[in-house]
């Protein structure tokens, strides 16, 4: 039998071709030139190889490549990726945007692996920050992406990248991250006229305070109440019943559903009887008539 | 979590050819590739063929003169299709993919019965 | 005539341990190729239950186990119990019909 560690007479790959799905694990090992693979990378997705056949070429590469492949080979790697670990992605300088989308189309209909993350991170870093045609990529393949990062990550986005944010992308986003996003979309959004901005604006809302909720009750926007829901509880509260009649318009008939919910909850508990009386809905749970509402945070605030 | 729904003719004639589609659901037909997989009632599994992301096809060296396989993407949907059938062809009919990065075949379509018989 | 052999049947009382055999040539599991174990229930589509020769998918209890050598392999089962009666198969890759080849399948009855 022939040693396992030589290429039978005969056998040595000329050229990366269909002939070596034929080889046997070792023979691949064997017969195949790192050197001959790494210019060759193109075809390897044009010739039908296991993925266990896969692992074989990927070890070909490490050996030519310790230190981590280079660009050109890495644009080529197809499904190869797939057997990349998070460690051999870290010794990687990805910079082009299009060698990032070959990748993550490799991955798609699957979840985020900790590979993938990992190459967005490298691939981030690299750039410096998060930009809109960066954002527009990964947001079209990971919807999710934008709320998996970090409110300090976040904080690199910058606003002009915002407008590639779709609704769906910021669903799994908390409060934290979106008190980051809003007033970069805030910012982004600003030359928009009323109707237009609130489209655009509604989805960070979740990260708006007070006071631009007061400013949005003046413009007849019809906020849902799915939006209202997730609105932070500390900016709903200061509201009174006429400013969030005006924010809601005729969808305030939905705060009766959500009376046992935050922020609604807690809103009418801050709210007097008399005034919620007027929506007629049936709210209860308001101040009693004749009683005295002492804002006791004011009062720290002041002393 | 990916789902594969097998549909097609449970009867067909002696010398006909036997078409059977393989649904994609919760997840993209870009997988590396995916495969046909049959057995024979009270016997064992075959592979029948595979079909690669980019159209690729490689088949059972025992078939390959009667198996097509193809894919459209825009259906989530790949199929078969094995001319001049006979009785030796009866079999439940599995669609297959692997696991992420592994030759193994983690998901599985629950299967179709297809008899050849006039 | 499968490609790869094993057993057509074998048997344990429950809380025994059983062997399942598969063995393959110079082409499959010779050649290096990892072995993959499917559990077949009656009317049902297999299930995978050992990829790359001993790794468990999540779900799939520590009572399996695979181990390789040379040509061939086999699926160990611990604490037997009625559950786990069904069909076994392995498979691997064959270099010479660059496809994949399966065992004939073994039937695992419980007593």
């Known amino acids: 039998e022939v040693e396992k560690t030589a290429c039978p007479s005969g056998k040595k790959a000329r050229e990366i071709d269909e002939s070596l799905i034929f080889y046997k694990k070792w023979e691949l090992e064997a017969c195949v030139d790192a050197a001959l693979l790494a210019t060759q990378m193109d075809r390897v997705n044009a010739i039908p190889f296991t993925y266990e056949q896969l692992d074989v070429l990927k070890h070909k590469l490490d050996e030519l490549y310790p230190q981590g492949y280079p660009e050109s080979v890495i644009q080529h790697l197809g499904y190869l990726f797939l057997k990349m670990s998070p460690e051999d992605i870290r010794k990687w300088n990805v910079t082009s945007l299009e060698t990032l989308k070959a990748l993550l189309e490799v991955n798609k209909g699957h979840e985020m692996s900790p590979q993938v993350a990992t190459l967005i991170d490298r691939f981030v870093k690299g750039r410096g920050q998060l930009d809109k045609d960066t954002l527009d990529t990964l947001t079209a393949f990971y919807p999710g992406y934008l709320c998996s990062l970090s409110p300090e990550e976040l904080s690199s986005v910058p606003p002009s990248s915002i407008w590639a944010v779709r609704p769906q992308d910021l669903d799994t986003c908390d409060p934290r991250q979106l008190d980051v996003l809003y007033p970069k979309a805030r910012l982004a959004f600003q030359n928009m006229n009323g109707s237009e901005y609130f489209v655009k604006i509604q989805s960070f809302l979740g990260g708006a305070p007070t006071e631009d909720l007061k400013a949005l009750s003046q413009q007849n926007v019809s906020m849902d109440l799915a939006t209202f829901m997730k609105l932070r509880t500390d900016a709903v509260l200061p509201l009174t019943v006429a400013e969030v009649q005006k924010l809601l318009g005729p969808h305030v008939e939905g705060l009766k559903a959500e009376e046992r919910h935050r922020p609604v909850r807690d809103w009418i508990l801050r709210q007097r009887q008399d005034d919620l009386d007027t929506l007629g809905l049936g709210l209860q749970g308001g101040i009693p008539n004749g009683y005295l509402v002492l804002d006791l945070s004011m009062q720290e605030a002041l002393s | 979590q990916v789902q594969l729904q097998e549909s097609g003719p449970g009867l067909v004639k002696p010398s006909e050819t036997l078409s059977l589609t393989c649904t994609v659901s919760g997840g993209s037909i870009s997988s590396y590739y995916w495969n046909w997989i049959r057995q024979p009632p009270g016997k064992g599994l075959e592979w029948i063929g595979r079909i690669y992301y980019n159209g690729n096809t490689y088949y059972n060296p025992s078939l390959k003169s009667r198996v097509t396989i193809s894919g459209d993407t825009s259906k989530n949907q790949f199929s078969l299709k094995l001319s001049s059938v006979t009785a030796a062809d009866t079999a439940v009919y599995y669609c297959a993919r692997p696991k992420l990065g592994i030759d193994a075949f983690d998901i599985w379509g629950q299967g179709t019965m297809v008899t050849v018989s006039s | 005539q499968s490609v790869l052999t094993q057993p057509p049947s074998v048997s344990g009382a429950p809380g025994q341990r059983v062997t399942i055999s598969c063995t393959g040539s110079?082409?499959?599991?010779?050649?290096?190729?990892?072995v993959h174990w499917y559990q077949q229930l009656p009317g049902t589509a297999p299930k995978l239950l050992i990829y790359g020769n001993s790794n468990r998918p999540s779900g799939v209890p520590d009572r399996f186990s695979g181990s390789k050598s040379g040509t061939s392999a086999s699926l160990a089962i611990t604490g037997l119990q009625a559950e786990d009666e069904a069909d076994y198969y392995c498979q691997s890759y064959d270099s010479s019909l660059s496809g994949w080849v399966f065992g004939g399948g073994t039937k695992l009855t419980v007593l």
């Open positions: 110079s082409s499959n599991i010779g050649a290096g190729y990892d």
